[in-house]
Interface confidence: low
């Protein structure tokens, strides 16, 4: 996926077999070409064009490959495929295309917080996350704690506010966003840091 | 100049009311959570009152509700508070902040003014 | 409401010492506690947000760490201006922001 901030192509690489990765000594590297102009038929570039990333394989029984794609080039498609060195034998994986521009992971939403309305209800907001270069729609999860009732829900809206209505004196409630690209392919950022605020007694 | 500048503290008598002002400059005030603070050697720093940015949520801890209020006046960038009913354990150098949104931290503080409740 | 508690309440130390103050929430905070630094007559001036981000301008030597419901504040090389009263602040649940009651720095 794309980060948010437009800079870096992230490939996780899991493997099916979880131990593989822990009880082998191997290589992982990542082969990737942003290719001028793709025909109608599939273009395989001459293997010298391909560059060569490193993949860290330290994080979460899974490698991260880093590959900087220029902003310019995000709606392109990239070719990229993975080659595995282990105990002198090389895997190589299937060529995989896929453009940029539709794996962006934004970085959660920012400002998250809550306030009543003149109205009696709670108003959730908070702020896009900068650089984002299309307009997110956002989940909005939030628990609701009294002396009475547990409520749970959970809202999808293009909007950086959420009315919540019905809302209890003496209340705690606890809210997380995240976003997502509204009007295309996306990945969903990773959830806001929960925020509580706690409505006062009447 | 981004600054925030406090004045209206003085020596008052308990019972008694006071205004404290804070005018604020270099930035929209409305678009911010402004607090008011206050210090004492005893309790350290203490949140009294917030106003939110929307003009109309108003906070205050538990020992001053129904006697403070605190508003604003966004034509001339100032943010007030309103003390009633004055008591010893007010006294205090009173603060207003500004708070960043995004972190929950207070970015601009005044210098602070003084109110002592004394007979 | 979160209760914020630091230690020590006060501190003696040397110029060039490395300094450690430590805060402790009621529950937990995750990584929204904020750090400010106070000298006499003068307002809380900001060094670390959200425990571990440095403020703009303030010197290196100052940082933060921990999450949940414990953090600290270390000075890595105590300069003689860093003598002050550090206060250090949640900002995870509102209302109301609470603060530590305060280490208070002194020259040995």
């Known amino acids: 996926w794309l980060k948010g901030d437009l800079k870096l192509f992230i490939c996780y690489v899991e493997s099916l077999f979880k131990n593989l990765f822990r009880n082998y000594n191997y290589k992982v590297h990542l082969l990737y070409v942003l290719p001028e102009v793709l025909e109608d038929s599939p273009l395989v570039p001459q293997k010298g064009s391909f560059q060569m990333v490193h993949c860290n394989c330290s994080v979460h029984e899974c490698c991260e490959c880093l590959v900087p794609v220029p902003t310019a080039k995000l709606n392109d498609t990239l070719l990229m495929c993975l080659k595995i060195t282990s105990g002198g034998v090389i895997f190589q994986s299937p060529l995989m295309s896929v453009q940029p521009i539709n794996m962006v992971k934004p970085d959660p939403p920012l400002g998250l917080h809550m306030e009543i309305t003149d109205d009696g209800n709670l108003k959730i907001s908070w702020s896009s996350p900068p650089l984002v270069p299309f307009p997110l729609q956002y989940q909005v999860k939030y628990s609701e704690n009294s002396t009475t009732v547990i409520r749970e829900a959970d809202k999808i809206v293009s909007a950086t506010s959420l009315l919540v209505d019905s809302i209890l004196p003496g209340s705690s409630y606890e809210v997380q966003v995240r976003g997502k690209r509204l009007d295309g392919p996306g990945i969903w950022s990773d959830w806001s840091t929960p925020r509580v605020f706690t409505t006062q007694d009447v | 100049q981004v600054q925030l500048v406090e004045s209206g503290g003085s020596v008052v008598q308990p019972g008694r009311s006071l205004r404290l002002s804070c005018a604020a400059s270099g930035f929209t005030f409305s678009t911010y959570a402004m607090y008011w603070v206050r210090q004492t050697p005893g309790k350290g720093l203490e949140w009294v009152a917030v106003?939110?940015?929307?003009?109309?949520?108003?906070y205050y801890i538990d020992s001053v509700k129904g006697r403070f209020t605190i508003s604003r006046d966004t034509s001339t960038n100032t943010l007030y508070l309103q003390m009633s009913s004055l008591r010893a354990d007010d006294s205090a150098l009173y603060y207003c902040a500004r708070l960043n949104w995004d972190y929950w931290y207070f970015d601009l503080w005044g210098r602070g003014t003084l109110v002592t409740v004394s007979s | 409401d979160i209760q914020m508690t630091q230690s020590p309440s006060s501190l003696s130390a040397s110029v060039g010492d490395r300094v450690t103050i430590t805060c402790r929430a009621s529950?937990?905070?995750?990584?929204?506690l904020n750090w400010y630094q106070q000298k006499p007559g003068k307002a809380p001036k900001l060094l670390i947000y959200a425990a571990s981000s440095l403020q703009s301008g303030v010197p290196s030597r100052f940082s933060g760490s921990g999450s949940g419901t414990d953090f600290t504040l270390t000075i890595s090389s105590l300069q003689p201006e860093d003598f002050a009263t550090y206060y250090c602040q949640q900002s995870y649940s509102t209302p109301p922001i609470t603060f530590g009651q305060g280490t208070r720095l002194e020259i040995k």
């Open positions: 106003l939110y940015s929307d003009g109309s949520n108003k």
């Open positions: 529950q937990s905070i995750s990584s929204y």
